[in-house]
């Protein structure tokens, strides 16, 4: 009878052990155990009777196809074997074991004692067949096993073979190297390779195999395993494999498809190739006089480029427009995109005007092109050139005028300051009452006009001024104080602010500039009561031209004692001293009650001690600060207080050969003006140079030269 | 033609404000001074302070400085003038003036409980 | 403050009369810078808002009768109706604006 055992382990015994077996018996145990696993017999005991070949009695272990072992009697001899300590092993997971005794036995025999055990298969390392190995790594479990694959590759649907994902792979470059994957190592299997070669239209893809070409093959049918096709539009070339690489292929086409397969199976180590865009070759080009094109080759083929450019100082000139490079291409019928531009000279072409500036050129014809000079000169002797600059500019290979110092930036006139077209006067003797001033003899005077329309009536009133720049007026402040009804300090509007320069006669405005007033600028600590601070400033609306009759007066050096006692220094004024002349009657016709041409007198510095003591003496609060110096004579006279507010005192400076504003006409008081020992009071300018420079907007050092030379 | 058209009379009790306006036209209201002069029944003139409408400058008579508020609406060309914590003193007839030469034609504030 | 005090409190007139009013300051009223001295006179008449008729001491305002004239310096002011006229009957007020402004007291000038 058969004993079906589904058990991973079990035991089998001969009938009636451990006694022994009954004859003519057969008993066949059929042991299965699931997939994965073998069937591992051994005998604890044997002892069967004895016969040749195993002809009587016998235990045969079989598989389905296949007897694995026949064992009996007690000990192996030449013609019958027991299985002692040998253990039987199944190839698979069913194991058959029949047990046979004959009709006789001559002795009494105890049979056998037998045991089976499931033991797992190690299918990665008994697997020889190539077909069921694992394509890359085999990984053994209790029971099974399972495949997998190397970084990049993807197991195919079989579970056993490794196949990369190359179907998406777009070449662009106009030349490039194609290969099987994983190239030289053997290429994967059971993959489908799509390669796309997509060029610009109006190049053609040209394949060259190289290297190696090794693609499975058969010696009888073409290529059934792995091949190569190329697809060029609705033609299809190959299928190609073996060792022989296919001849060059010209494809005619920008547009090309290689497909590459491969099967389950086989070793072998793939392709390679490249390609080339091949496109109409444009004609040679010659470079233009002086210039040149890049790169310099023997032959240029649809898109190449040429850049075209010039040798220094030249431009590339195309369609009348300059540039610096130009770019040509070799068009797909065999042209140039363009024509070759020419190379033109650089022309930096006429030089910036320069204000208060002349040019002269130093190269012939007045050229002005590449490596020509100019200079530049200031307007002598109202102007002169900042930093004493050279002046010189060239044409540089960029098309501007540069300078060695200044570069691209044109050079800067300041006014000249101090020097009257005119010489002023010896100073040696007094002029009583004051004198009229020759024109030019005070290009700096200026006449201040305050018209402040916010009242009604309107209020006017105005003041002298000195111009320190084409841009700047020096003056009091308390000339540009709004005349409010309260005692704070406020500069008047500067809509109400008109500036008169060059003005000699009151009557004859014609050959006078009016300018309006841009910024009006108060000494922040200018002090209403006693007039401590009185200086201000004033910019221009425009920079106003200089000349013979218009010109600065130089700023002092920056020292705290201000005009030494008893130097001799000037004032003018047009000496409107009277309460009833109306501004309108000074600016127009002009009254016999004041001066129309411009008075000047000539006063010596008092010492700052007399001068307190003088005021202090007299009933009144009376403050001659630091800030302030007096100037005038003992005895008094018209001459002491000629000068209008904000007028400049001005002392010459044997260092630089220069006039400069020392005083400000600041106040006096309170007797009659000229009475015996009431000076006048003039706002200390040396104290004040650093806060005029910064109004300015000027750094000293740039300016001071003028004064220091 | 050149005018200043004042708002109407009020009546306000003891510690209240009032706020009076004033109407400029016929001339370019920003750049000229707005003062505020008042004048007490049977009584004479008192400056009470001004506004550059342009600016929003202010001066005030000490004695109004921390009761009156000068303001303008250039837009509209108007000047107000608001008194506050006002006192039975403060009834007077209330001018808003163009600098010195042009008067406005007065709004009486009666201050009664 | 700068007090302004009017002489006399008030004036009886003749028609076709002078009248002449006074106003003194407590301190000057000229400006040094634009030398002008800011007094101001002004007419009042019953019911109406004051008017201009001088200012920086002694200008006429355009439109006023030539009859008044303002006159004086520093502290001391007068303004004067020449011939009096039956529309001249009002209080007068002189003001400064040297300063924050300040009033008289008013002169009332009436017909004798």
């Known amino acids: 009878h058969t004993v079906e055992l589904n058990n991973m382990f079990g035991q089998i015994q001969s009938p009636g052990y451990p006694d022994s077996y009954p004859s003519d018996s057969e008993v066949t145990w059929n042991i299965t155990v699931p997939d994965g696993f073998r069937i591992k017999l051994y005998f604890m005991h044997f002892n069967l009777e004895s016969s040749y070949l195993c002809e009587y009695d016998y235990v045969k272990v079989e598989t389905e196809d296949q007897v694995l072992a026949t064992f009996c009697g007690r000990e192996t001899t030449d013609t019958e074997q027991t299985p002692g300590q040998e253990v039987v092993l199944s190839p698979g997971s069913f194991m058959s074991i029949t047990f046979r005794s004959d009709f006789s036995n001559e002795e009494r025999f105890t049979g056998f004692d037998a045991h089976y055990m499931a033991v797992d298969v190690d299918e990665c390392k008994e697997r020889e067949d190539e077909e069921l190995s694992c394509d890359h790594y085999c990984h053994n479990y209790i029971g099974g096993y399972y495949c997998s694959c190397r970084f990049g590759y993807i197991l195919h649907t079989d579970n056993r073979t490794c196949r990369v994902e190359c179907s998406d792979n777009l070449f662009t470059q106009r030349t490039g190297v194609i290969t099987s994957p994983d190239f030289p190592n053997p290429y994967p299997k059971s993959s489908e390779c799509l390669y796309t070669i997509e060029l610009e239209e109006g190049f053609m893809v040209n394949l060259q195999f190289e290297d190696i070409f090794d693609i499975e093959d058969h010696p009888e049918v073409p290529c059934p395993y792995d091949y190569i096709k190329i697809k060029v539009g609705p033609k299809v070339l190959g299928p190609f494999c073996g060792e022989k690489a296919p001849e060059p292929i010209s494809t005619q086409s920008h547009s090309v498809l290689i497909l590459f397969h491969s099967d389950n199976s086989g070793e072998n180590r793939g392709w390679r190739l490249s390609y080339r865009a091949a496109g109409n070759e444009c004609p040679e080009l010659q470079p233009p006089v002086h210039g040149k094109i890049e790169p310099s080759q023997a032959k240029y083929f649809f898109k190449d480029q040429v850049l075209v450019s010039c040798d220094t100082g030249y431009k590339v000139l195309k369609d009348n427009v300059e540039m610096d490079t130009f770019q040509i291409e070799c068009l797909k019928d065999g042209t140039w995109s363009n024509k070759i531009p020419t190379c033109k000279i650089v022309d930096c072409r006429a030089p910036g005007e320069l204000e208060h500036g002349l040019i002269t050129f130093s190269t012939r014809n007045n050229l002005t092109t590449y490596k020509s000079e100019i200079k530049y000169s200031c307007q002598e002797p109202y102007y002169k050139m900042l930093n004493n600059n050279t002046g010189i500019y060239t044409c540089s290979a960029q098309g501007v005028w540069m300078n060695k110092v200044l570069g691209r930036s044109l050079p800067t006139c300041l006014p000249e300051c101090g020097q009257p077209s005119r010489s002023l006067p010896s100073l040696v003797k007094r002029i009583i009452g004051g004198r009229n001033a020759e024109p030019g003899l005070f290009p700096w005077q200026a006449l201040i006009v305050v018209e402040d329309t916010s009242r009604v009536p309107n209020d006017k009133w105005f003041g002298s001024g000195a111009l320190l720049s084409a841009s700047w007026i020096l003056t009091a402040a308390h000339v540009l104080r709004s005349q409010r009804r309260d005692t704070t300090v406020i500069p008047v509007s500067k809509e109400h602010v008109t500036v008169y320069l060059g003005l000699h006669d009151v009557r004859d405005k014609s050959g006078a500039v009016n300018s309006s007033a841009a910024r009006v600028v108060l000494h922040p600590d200018f002090n209403i009561q006693n007039y401590n601070h009185d200086i201000a400033l004033v910019q221009l609306q425009e920079p106003v031209p200089l000349g013979p009759h218009v010109m600065p007066v130089c700023l002092p050096r920056l020292e705290p004692e201000g005009p030494a006692p008893h130097m001799l220094g000037l004032v003018a004024g047009w000496g409107i001293s009277n309460p009833n002349v109306t501004v309108d009657e000074i600016i127009s016709s002009g009254t016999r009650t004041l001066s129309d041409v411009l008075q000047y007198v000539k006063l010596p510095v008092v010492p700052h001690a007399e001068c307190k003591t003088s005021y202090e003496s007299r009933s009144g609060n009376y403050s001659v600060t630091e800030n302030m110096f007096c100037a005038g004579y003992y005895e008094g006279g018209k001459d002491t207080c000629l000068g209008d507010s904000g007028g400049a005192f001005v002392i010459f400076d044997d260092l630089s050969q220069r006039w400069v504003v020392q005083g400000l006409v600041s106040w006096g008081g309170p007797e009659e003006c000229g009475s015996k020992q009431v000076y006048g009071v003039y706002t200390k300018v040396s104290n004040y140079v650093d806060w005029v420079w910064e109004q300015m907007g000027l750094p000293q050092s740039v300016v001071e030269p003028q004064v220091e030379r | 033609q050149v005018q200043l058209v004042q708002s109407g009379a009020e009546v306000k009790k003891p510690g209240a404000s009032v706020k009076v306006s004033c109407k400029a036209s016929?001339?370019?209201?920003?750049?000229?001074?707005i003062e505020w002069v008042r004048q007490a029944p049977g009584q004479g003139l008192e400056w009470i302070g001004e506004?550059?409408?342009?600016?929003?400058?202010?001066d005030y008579n000490e004695r109004f400085k921390d009761r009156a508020t000068f303001t303008a609406d250039t837009s509209t060309s108007t000047a107000y003038m608001e008194l506050s914590s006002l006192r039975s003193e403060d009834t007077a007839v209330y001018y808003c003036?163009?600098?010195?030469?042009?008067w406005g034609q007065g709004t009486l504030v009666t201050v009664s409980s | 403050d700068i007090v302004m005090t009017q002489s006399p409190d008030s004036l009886a007139v003749s028609l076709g009369e002078r009248a002449t009013i006074n106003c003194k300051s407590s301190?000057?009223?000229?400006?040094?810078?634009?030398?002008?001295?800011?007094l101001a006179w002004y007419q009042q008449k019953p019911g109406q808002p004051p008017k201009l008729l001088i200012y920086?001491?002694?200008t006429r305002e355009s439109g006023v009768p030539d009859r008044f004239s303002g006159s004086g310096s520093g502290t001391d002011f007068t303004l004067t109706i020449s011939s009096l006229q039956a529309e001249d009957v009002a209080v007068y007020y002189c003001?400064?604006?040297?300063?924050?402004?300040?009033f008289g007291g008013g002169t009332k000038v009436e017909i004798k």
């Open positions: 506004i550059l409408p342009g600016s929003g400058s202010t």
């Open positions: 003001k400064q604006s040297y300063t924050l402004p300040t």
């Open positions: 016929g001339y370019t209201f920003t750049g000229k001074w």
């Open positions: 003036v163009r600098s010195e030469d042009l």
């Open positions: 920086w001491a002694s």
């Open positions: 301190q000057s009223l000229l400006n040094s810078v634009t030398r002008k001295t800011y």
